[in-house]
């Protein structure tokens, strides 16, 4: 019996087609992805093959203005239109709290939404009961297939699930649900979830009875043969894990942003054992036409977005200096504003000992692309922010050692004065540079804001301590020469859309007045004056 698994993950509100790097589509003849194009390919496969499942491994939420405006209603609507068979909850599905998951998505999806390791307690238990499930048995042709869901245990640190959801260890939670499926005589079982490739492989190894793992969260690109675009494969597709009980378990993931459609063919014997598995992600490029009816629907939904982007979010009473003459040379108040928004977006009081789990932000000055003039009645719109942050990136959470941070700050000024983008803007950090010293030895003071304290204050950076830092995904991936971050980070979780973070902060504050306040100081040691 042959099963075709089509799968997506980490689509992050790319409902419309995008450019090759998953940012806004500029030249339509070279654009990729989007739900209209995805539908064309899915329907083509459904017509050609008998037993097809379309699965999503989480993080449909968050990533473009689509999510900002429609708040998940767009996800339910278009996933229903594409007739997804099941979805696992990702961490970003909780970005607007539990209500922001229940109302737009859980109540409106016409397909099951799954997670076995999220347990509701207190008053939420009865409210959310039955709206998501630990597993689902799906009829496929004359057979049935079991799907068990899982979600990153880190979700309370990455999103806003509130206090009434408990995120359990994935393997511990999955095993009894798989066992339950076995007692129902369901002998073909797929684990579908959102905890990253390392956990996907562990699930394949440790959870008895799981035949296939379809994952997400780590945006892992797997491919067999010559890859069709810019993504470099982390391994073959499918990635084969030998389980502790000696079975070969295929593990797959399909990069992110709807750029590819994962395509895995599995052959089962009559006892539900996997005999063979093969496939590859399909690049959804312009050779695949966009489905006209879905495209028309997208265009209809688009109208509200254009309207939204010109509405006032809040006001500034000061000039927001996002000029390269400032942000690539010294502390600039646009950099301070963005970093403050980044920290504010990551307030999660999950432990009495800590006022917050993260206090530090770094931001490459080259990523700030425009100032905002306060003399336009002080008005700030989404459109204004899109000029400041035009790359459609995310503000991510990383963990790294103090020694890595020190290297990053040395890199920040290693060729100071040439208007290069690596000069870092900061939050929760006080740095002093001596630019008369040789490159690689210019950081003379680096103090960081404590987290395990009731009154936040600045302490010297400790080289061996592990710190959490919020930064653009561009930096986490080693951009602007920050190779040391990419190479040495201990953990990296993708965060919220950059513009969305700043717009939410401005809406919350209503009126903003960020200052240049001595977070970054630089001197040429022999004459001790500061540049501001």
């Amino acid at each position: 019996w042959e099963l075709t698994i089509l799968h997506t993950n980490d689509v992050h509100s790319r409902l419309e087609q995008t450019s090759e790097d998953s940012s806004k589509c500029v030249n339509a003849s070279r654009c990729m992805g989007g739900v209209a194009r995805l539908f064309t390919k899915v329907q083509q496969i459904r017509r050609a093959e008998p037993n097809v499942l379309l699965l999503d491994a989480g993080d449909q939420y968050q990533g473009t203005i689509w999510f900002t405006v429609y708040k998940g209603a767009e996800v339910a609507h278009f996933m229903n239109a594409l007739r997804y068979d099941a979805m696992a909850l990702g961490n970003h599905e909780f970005d607007n709290g539990v209500e922001g998951l229940i109302e737009p998505l859980l109540k409106e999806a016409k397909f099951p939404i799954l997670s076995a390791n999220i347990k509701a307690k207190g008053p939420l238990a009865s409210q959310i009961s039955g709206l998501y499930l630990p597993y689902k048995v799906l009829p496929v042709g004359d057979e049935v297939v079991g799907i068990v869901g899982y979600t990153s245990k880190e979700t309370p640190f990455l999103s806003n699930p509130g206090t009434n959801l408990v995120f359990e260890d994935e393997i511990t939670a999955l095993q009894p649900e798989v066992d339950k499926l076995k007692t129902l005589n369901v002998n073909k079982i797929i684990a579908l979830g959102h905890s990253g490739f390392e956990m996907d492989k562990l699930i394949a190894q440790k959870v008895r009875g799981v035949d296939v793992v379809v994952g997400g969260h780590s945006n892992t690109f797997l491919y067999t043969g010559n890859p069709p675009s810019k993504e470099v494969p982390a391994g073959k597709y499918p990635f084969i894990v030998t389980s502790d009980d000696g079975r070969k378990v295929p593990v797959v993931q399909a990069y992110a942003f709807g750029k590819y459609l994962g395509y895995l063919k599995i052959e089962f014997d009559e006892r539900g054992n996997v005999i063979s598995s093969h496939g590859n992600p399909i690049l959804l490029n312009s050779s695949i036409p966009e489905d006209p009816s879905i495209k028309a629907d997208i265009n209809k939904w688009r109208i509200k977005l254009d309207n939204y982007s010109t509405q006032e979010l809040g006001k500034t009473i000061v000039y927001l200096d996002g000029s390269s003459q400032s942000c690539r040379f010294r502390e600039c108040n646009m950099g301070n504003l963005i970093c403050d928004a980044m920290i504010n977006n990551n307030l999660r009081h999950t432990d009495e000992m800590f006022w917050n789990h993260v206090s530090m932000c770094i931001l490459n000055g080259g990523g700030i692309r425009s100032p905002i003039d306060e003399r336009n009645n002080g008005t700030i719109t989404w459109e204004n922010l899109a000029a400041v942050l035009p790359f459609g990136g995310t503000f991510d959470l990383v963990q790294l050692k103090g020694s890595t941070l020190k290297k990053a700050f040395e890199h920040s000024v290693h060729r100071y004065g040439q208007s290069t983008g690596e000069f870092l803007q900061v939050g929760g950090i006080h740095v002093v540079y001596d630019l008369s010293r040789k490159p690689g030895d210019r950081v003379v003071k680096l103090d960081v804001l404590c987290t395990k304290c009731r009154v936040p204050s600045y302490d010297p950076l400790k080289m061996d301590e592990v710190y959490k830092v919020i930064l653009p995904n561009f930096l986490a991936n080693g951009g602007d020469g920050f190779q040391m971050i990419k190479d040495e980070l201990l953990r990296h979780d993708s965060g919220d859309q950059d513009i969305n973070v700043v717009s939410t902060y401005i809406s919350k504050m209503k009126v903003i007045y960020p200052a240049v306040e001595g977070r970054i100081k630089a001197h040429h040691h022999h004459h001790h004056h500061h540049h501001h």
């Epitope: 109540k107 409106e108 999806a109 016409k110 397909f111 099951p112 039955g130 048995v137 009829p139």
Partner: nanobody, 124 residues
Framework: ALQLVESGGGLVQPGGSLRLSCEVS????????IGWFRQAPGKEREGVSC????????YYADSVKGRFTISRDNAKNTVYLQMNSLKPEDTGVYYC?????????????????WGQGTEVTVSS
């Protein structure tokens, strides 16, 4: 929470008719496939009939084809099973059940939500 409550069962003579109702609460009925199942004393639970979310597709077990009709009133959040030409072998507890998905099925394993059941006895 999602709930299904069956009613309309009772004692009926062979050849007679009954109309079972299943009232659902806590969810939008048209997003769910609804099935009727029955369990005779000492026997396995068996699928009788099911209806897709829109009501567009219906399926029947061979043993009841032509005698039973499933219908739904999504506005009233209720699903009905009209049973005509009843036979003694139709006796049992009748359950309604629901699940979200695109493909209606008579396989009990695919159903996630179940009612408590209503008893039907066909006897002279």
């Amino acid at each position: 929470a999602l709930q299904l409550v069956e009613s309309g069962g009772g004692l009926v003579q062979p050849g007679g008719s009954l109309r079972l109702s299943c009232e659902v609460s806590g969810f939008t009925l048209d997003y769910y496939n609804i099935g009727w199942f029955r369990q005779a004393p000492g026997k396995e639970r068996e699928g009788v009939s099911c209806s897709s979310g829109s009501g567009g597709s219906t399926y029947y077990a061979d043993s009841v084809k032509g005698r039973f009709t499933i219908s739904r009133d999504n506005a009233k959040n209720t699903v009905y099973l009209q049973m005509n030409s009843l036979k003694p072998e139709d006796t049992g507890v009748y359950y309604c059940a629901a699940y979200r998905g695109w493909h209606p099925s008579l396989d009990a394993r695919v159903y996630d939500y179940w009612g408590q059941g209503t008893e039907v006895t066909v006897s002279s």
